[in-house]
Interface confidence: low
Amino acid sequence: SQVSQNCHNGSYEISVLMMGNSAFAEPLKNLEDAVNEGLEIVRGRLQNAGLNVTVNATFMYSDGLIHNSGDCRSSTCEGLDLLRKISNAQRMGCVLIGPSCTYSTFQMYLDTELSYPMISAGSFGLSCDYKETLTRLMSPARKLMYFLVNFWKTNDLPFKTYSWSTSYVYKNGTETEDCFWYLNALEASVSYFSHELGFKVVLRQDKEFQDILMDHNRKSNVIIMCGGPEFLYKLKGDRAVAEDIVIILVDLFNDQYFEDNVTAPDYMKNVLVLTLSPGNSLLNSSFSRNLSPTKRDFALAYLNGILLFGHMLKIFLENGENITTPKFAHAFRNLTFEGYDGPVTLDDWGDVDSTMVLLYTSVDTKKYKVLLTYDTHVNKTYPVDMSPTFTWKNSKLPNDITGRGPQ
């Protein structure tokens, strides 16, 4: 049925889906706080622009009786049930902020006539790529994939003189939602990553991973995994590692590496960490440490979703344009808006762009140091440390296949 949108005559409402099944186990109260804080910023910005309008949020909670796994496994139906709830109440906002699980977002997008924008903190999977009215405010798997291919091909840096074409991927099925979809994208046989690599094998057992570390017959020196340093230690422990092994640890939503007092443990010396550049005001600030880093990024994405809506609302109102139109629904892309921590850029498909940072452990200082950065918007790598103090021979990353060319 056609649901009327509460989105005109100076009153603009945001529908926020508060789903029990979520990409991150963040208390819904924190997400509510983030949304309310975002609303207040939007009201202030609209007021400063001379736009005398009302902006509110309606929080839509699911009953939690059926879909209670708490993670994303049973999110598909929960999302549709919430949409049904909105439909029955005949109350839909100008924008839908909500589903963070790839399963639920994909299904909701498929099963609804989307004449309104959908903003997601999550929906990392490739199945949510290229959706015309979906905006994703946390780095999706496609962005990771493009970085990896770019980095694999790079061979003209002082510390990386070989192109790589092989990799192992460790994926044991216990990953967090973001890691699950990141690794899923690398595993998929039809993905860009798989297409560009000559050899790729997925390691699913701890023992497989552990054996590779010293296996003289291994087919690649490079292993990609996803998680934090503790996750790696649980798996690797203090086992010996062949000197030309490179572990790429994908840990995007974790800014602990940038804290002043952090020392890299010894087991991280063979590891390159891929993470996101922390926001402008995170370093050396009184930013609260009450939330874990990942949860902070999740709540921040909700908050930025509100600010994005405020940005678009302001533009359309200033231009005297209608909000309940396909034009508005399709407008949440190919733009930069003022986020909570500074400018946020969305690509042509509404996915957030960011600066990814590749870190290494300095053998001199035992600190994490920036090796290079990668701008997802232009798909370009920028070397930072031209003479890194690596653990690897000659302070260069090894070839990906042992015995191929000089080491």
Epitope: N30, D33, N36, E37, E40, I41, R43, G44, R45, N48, S281, N284, S285, S286, F287, S288, R289, N290, L291, A299, Y340
Partner: nanobody, 129 residues
Framework: QVQLAESGGGSVQSGGSLRLSCAAS????????MAWFRQAPGKEREGVAV?????????TYADSVKGRFTISQDNAKNMLYLQMNSLKPEDTAMYYC?????????????????????WGQGTQVTVSS
């Protein structure tokens, strides 16, 4: 509409004291970062002190005023204050009250942030030697 109005500025001798006040109205939200900024002629605006409106605890001060200035509030009256003691000629500036809803969980304001959303008109403080 959030509105801020400062008062209490004036001229004072070096070593003297002043108390600035800021009356706030139009709040629609319970938590704000409340701050005092100052701008001396020909210089950039700088943060002096910041506090969270619903939290009597942690205030943050610029190094140049630590131990001399105290930020405080009276939530019942929606007032923000800046008690300035041991004033120096280099404290001469226009002083602004500012508010911003960007308070993170745990009630902290961002140190060093200058892009506050709401500003008062300012009150002049002149310290002569």
């Amino acid at each position: 509409q959030v509105q801020l109005a400062e008062s209490g500025g004036g001229s004072v001798q070096s070593g003297g004291s002043l108390r600035l006040s800021c009356a706030a109205s139009g709040y629609t939200y319970s938590r704000y970062c409340m701050a005092w900024f100052r701008q001396a002629p020909g210089k950039e605006r700088e943060g002096v002190a910041v506090i969270v409106s619903d939290n009597d605890g942690s205030a943050t001060y610029a190094d140049s005023v630590k131990g001399r200035f105290t930020i405080s509030q009276d939530n019942a009256k929606n007032m923000l204050y800046l008690q300035m003691n041991s004033l120096k000629p280099e404290d001469t500036a226009m002083y602004y009250c500012a508010a911003d809803p960007r308070v993170w969980y745990g009630g902290t304001c961002r140190a060093g942030r200058t892009d506050f959303l709401y500003w008062g008109q300012g009150t002049q403080v002149t310290v002569s030697s």
